[in-house]
C-alpha cells in the first residue's frame, strides 16, 4: 500500500490537496522523494476508483497514515508495504 519511488522525472504534481481520504478508498500511496528534478517531496494517492490525488505532504492525516503503515509493515498490515526503485 505504501511505495517509495526514486525517479529522474520532474515534479508529477501540479496541484496538491490536504483533503482527508478514508483508508477504505485508498489502493496505494506513492512517495516521490525530493530531488532528481523536483525540489519537493510528493505524495500520490491512488484511489480504488482509479483516480489519482496528489496530497500535501504537510497534511497531518497523510503523515499519520504513513507512520501507521510503516509501523504495521513488519507484522500486521493486510496489504504488503514495499519500496521500489524506478530508474
Amino acid at each position: 500500500v505504501l511505495e517509495v519511488y526514486y525517479t529522474s522525472l520532474r515534479c508529477r504534481c501540479v496541484q496538491e490537496s490536504s483533503v482527508f481520504i478514508p483508508r477504505r478508498f485508498i489502493d496505494r500511496i506513492q512517495i516521490l522523494p525530493r530531488g532528481n528534478g523536483c525540489p519537493r517531496k510528493e505524495i500520490i494517492v491512488w484511489k480504488k476508483n482509479k483516480s489519482i490525488v496528489c496530497v500535501d505532504p504537510q497534511a497531518e492525516w497523510i503523515q499519520r497514515m504513513m507512520e501507521v503503515l510503516r509501523k504495521r509493515s513488519s507484522s500486521t498490515l493486510p496489504v504488503p508495504v514495499f519500496k521500489r526503485k524506478i530508474p
Epitope: P22, R24, K48, N49, E60, W61, R64, V68
Partner: antibody, heavy 120, light 107 residues
Framework: EVQLVESGGGLVQPGGSLRLSCAAS????????MSWVRQAPGKGLEWVAE????????NYAPSLKDRFTISRDNAKNSLYLQMNSLRAEDTAVYYC?????????????WGQGTTVTVSS | DIQMTQSPSSLSASVGDRVTITCKVS??????VAWYQQKPGKAPKLLIY???YRYTGVPSRFSGSGSGTDFTFTISSLQPEDIATYYC?????????FGGGTKLEIK
C-alpha cells in the same frame, strides 16, 4: 435543494421481504457514494451498507450482508435496499444518506427515513 | 470491527455552559471521525467531519478535535436549540461504525 426521499417501508411478517427505495433530487446522483443507515426504536444509529457511483464497489455491515442487498439505478436517481429473511430485530427507521467527497465521504445529506416493522 | 465508545451516554447542562463529549476508538482511524446531531423524530445532521472540520452552515459554537483513537466534540456555549442526541462515527474503514450516542438535556 438536495432531497432524499425513502419509501417502501411497512409491516412485514418475520421471514418476509421488503424492498426500500430512495429517490434523489437536486443532486447529480451518479456522482455520489450512497449509504443506508438504520435506527431501531429508542436505539442508536447502525450503518447497513454503502455503494459507489458505478455500483462496482459495495460494502455491508457483516451481520447483514447475507440478507440485505444494496443497489442503485443512476438513470432513475434511485437507491435500493432489498431485505430478505426479515427478523424482529430488523424493525427500525431506515435512512438513505449521501456521502460527499467535499465532507471527506461523510454522510452530509439524509432522507427523512422510512419505517420497517417486522412482526407477526 | 472498529468500536466507538462514546461518553457520557447522557448529560444535563444549562444554557451557556460548555459541553464536551468524548469518543474513544478501538483502533487508529486517523482523522476519520464525524459528529452528527439528531433531534427527536428527525434524521441526523452532519456537524463535524474529519475530526475538526465544521460542515457548511454549522454554527461556530460546535467544534471537534482529535486524531488516532481519541476524539472530542465541544459546544462552547449551549443554546436551547442544541437539545438533541449526538453521535460520533468513524468512516476510516468498513464497516462504518457509530458511537452509542449522547443525549443532551437542558437543566
Amino acid at each position: 435543494e438536495v432531497q432524499l426521499v425513502e419509501s417502501g417501508g411497512g409491516l412485514v411478517q418475520p421471514g418476509g421481504s421488503l424492498r426500500l427505495s430512495c429517490a434523489a433530487s437536486g443532486i447529480d446522483f451518479s456522482r455520489y457514494w450512497m449509504s443506508w443507515v438504520r435506527q431501531a426504536p429508542g436505539k442508536g444509529l447502525e450503518w447497513v451498507a454503502e455503494i459507489n457511483p458505478e455500483a462496482s464497489s459495495i460494502n455491508y455491515a457483516p451481520s447483514l450482508k447475507d440478507r440485505f442487498t444494496i443497489s442503485r439505478d443512476n438513470a432513475k436517481n434511485s437507491l435500493y435496499l432489498q431485505m430478505n429473511s426479515l427478523r424482529a430485530e430488523d424493525t427500525a427507521v431506515y435512512y438513505c444518506a449521501r456521502q460527499d467527497d467535499y465532507s471527506h465521504y461523510t454522510m452530509d445529506y439524509w432522507g427523512q427515513g422510512t419505517t420497517v416493522t417486522v412482526s407477526s | 470491527d472498529i468500536q466507538m465508545t462514546q461518553s457520557p451516554s447522557s448529560l444535563s447542562a444549562s444554557v451557556g455552559d460548555r459541553v464536551t463529549i468524548t469518543c474513544k476508538v478501538s483502533q487508529d482511524v486517523n482523522t476519520g471521525v464525524a459528529w452528527y446531531q439528531q433531534k427527536p423524530g428527525k434524521a441526523p445532521k452532519l456537524l463535524i467531519y474529519s475530526a475538526s472540520y465544521r460542515y457548511t452552515g454549522v454554527p461556530s459554537r460546535f467544534s471537534g478535535s482529535g486524531s488516532g483513537t481519541d476524539f472530542t466534540f465541544t459546544i462552547s456555549s449551549l443554546q436551547p436549540e442544541d437539545i438533541a442526541t449526538y453521535y460520533c462515527q468513524q468512516y476510516y474503514s468498513t464497516p462504518l461504525t457509530f458511537g452509542g450516542g449522547t443525549k443532551l438535556e437542558i437543566k
